[in-house]
């Protein structure tokens, strides 16, 4: 809900020669005073004096950190990722104890062949980054490994990664069904036991711009919201112009308070403006003074 203009107002002369009605009550939180040397500064809302000026905390700005910004920087990651924990059973290689040692020549050769095979399997998936073997164990060789996926951050990144994980499942199921041993021989790069293929776990990057926006807005969290422009999220208050949620104050100035965004209406030489959006103009009556 938007606050109405306080009854008690102070008229300030604007740069255009008109006046702006501003609240005479202090809507900010209690004053914090910090002293450096013999310089005393009133830095409000948790701001601190650095010897020259107030250093304000988000979402405040101004000489005394008394004003609320119209937009807050939020920085989604450039890329987002998913990690799939998979198990496959390779039948074309027999297990030896040396495979347990990740620095052995056996492990390095197995890793090379397995990586080549998986790169072929997942070659059509744009989000595919690679595989990482986490453990090898007996049976012929049970391969516990991670499939790594990555994509550029967009608002739909979760859908993109979810789709990619589904394609990974389809492709690994297909290859482990088709590339199987015949008479104890494998004619493919690797052969598999069809029943040994399992997806253990899927972890997807969690990033919520709305959550970051609300956290940074602190006590104004209910009044800041996220809007997208060119797939980039912006954390804005209704006082930020140019967005769908922007508040149109017509003949006035938008200002944030702890009750939300409100319009402070101007008074010109000819009109008073009022209303929630400063769109109701009342013409002043003219009194002529003779000298």
């Amino acid at each position: 809900p938007l606050a109405t203009i306080p009854v008690s107002t102070t008229s300030l002369t604007s740069s255009e020669g008109s006046t702006i009605s501003t609240p005479s009550v202090d809507i900010s939180t209690p004053v914090t005073t910090s002293i450096v040397g013999d310089q005393c500064s009133r830095c409000k809302n948790g701001g601190f004096w650095d010897g020259l000026k107030c250093q304000c905390l988000t979402p405040y700005y101004g000489e005394s950190c008394e004003e609320v910004v119209n937009s807050i920087d939020i920085a989604p990651p450039e890329t987002v990722s998913a990690q799939m924990e998979l198990t496959v059973t390779v039948t074309s290689v027999k297990f030896t104890d040396e495979l347990k040692n990740h620095s052995s020549q056996e492990f390095r050769e197995f890793n090379k062949t397995f990586t080549e095979q998986m790169n072929i399997v997942y070659s059509g998936i744009p989000e595919y980054v690679g595989v990482n073997i986490t453990n090898l164990r007996l049976g012929s060789v049970v391969v516990e490994h991670d499939v790594l996926l990555r994509t550029k951050y967009t608002p739909e990144y979760k859908t993109a990664l979810d789709n990619a994980t589904e394609v990974v499942k389809q492709k690994i199921t297909k290859v482990t069904t088709e590339q199987i041993m015949t008479n104890d021989n494998c004619s493919a790069l690797m052969c598999f036991n069809t029943t040994g293929t399992q997806v253990q776990n899927i972890t997807v990057t969690q990033y919520d711009p709305v959550e970051e926006c609300r956290q940074k807005a602190e006590e104004y969290e209910d009044y800041f919201l996220v809007e997208y422009r060119d797939q980039k999220p912006y954390c804005i208050s209704p006082c930020e112009s140019g967005f769908n949620a922007s508040k149109n104050c017509n003949h006035g100035k938008c200002q944030m308070s702890q009750n939300g965004a409100r319009c402070l209406c101007v008074t010109t030489e000819t009109h008073w403006y009022s209303g929630e959006d400063c769109n109701q103009g009342t013409q002043k009556s003219h009194h002529h003074h003779h000298h």
Partner: nanobody, 123 residues
Framework: EVQLVESGGGVVQPGGSLRLSCAAS????????WGWFRQAPGKEREAVAL???????FYADSVKGRFTISRDNSKNTLYLQMNSLRAEDTAVYYC?????????????????WGQGTMVTVSS
């Protein structure tokens, strides 16, 4: 570093015999897998005879009963005894090795290769 050096190739008449050798170094010869592959002009490399440390052996259908793979661990050497040679056996023969105990005929799964020795069967 693993090094494989083949020898024993040459020109032989149909029905004749040859014995190929592959000397290995930088490798524990008693473990892993060893094999002979061949590549005829304009064709893909194919598995001829393979052997693994656990006793597994493979022979291509076209050489069964004519070729024999063996190894001498004390000499770190792999052999291919080729009898009753035919014109279609003409190819470059490659020795291959892996520290893994393999069951695969696919050359891409084999990591170490010799430079090859030419076998020509011609009258």
């Amino acid at each position: 570093e693993v090094q494989l050096v083949e020898s024993g190739g040459g020109v032989v008449q149909p029905g004749g015999s040859l014995r190929l050798s592959c000397a290995a170094s930088g490798f524990t010869f008693s473990r892993g897998s060893w094999g002979w592959f061949r590549q005829a002009p304009g064709k893909e490399r194919e598995a001829v005879a393979l052997i693994s440390s656990d006793g597994w052996t493979f022979y291509a259908d076209s050489v069964k009963g004519r070729f024999t793979i063996s190894r001498d661990n004390s000499k770190n050497t792999l052999y291919l005894q080729m009898n009753s040679l035919r014109a279609e056996d003409t190819a470059v023969y490659y020795c291959a090795a892996s520290v893994l105990v393999l069951r695969t005929l696919n050359p891409k799964a084999w990591h170490h290769w010799g430079q090859g020795t030419m076998v020509t069967v011609s009258s």
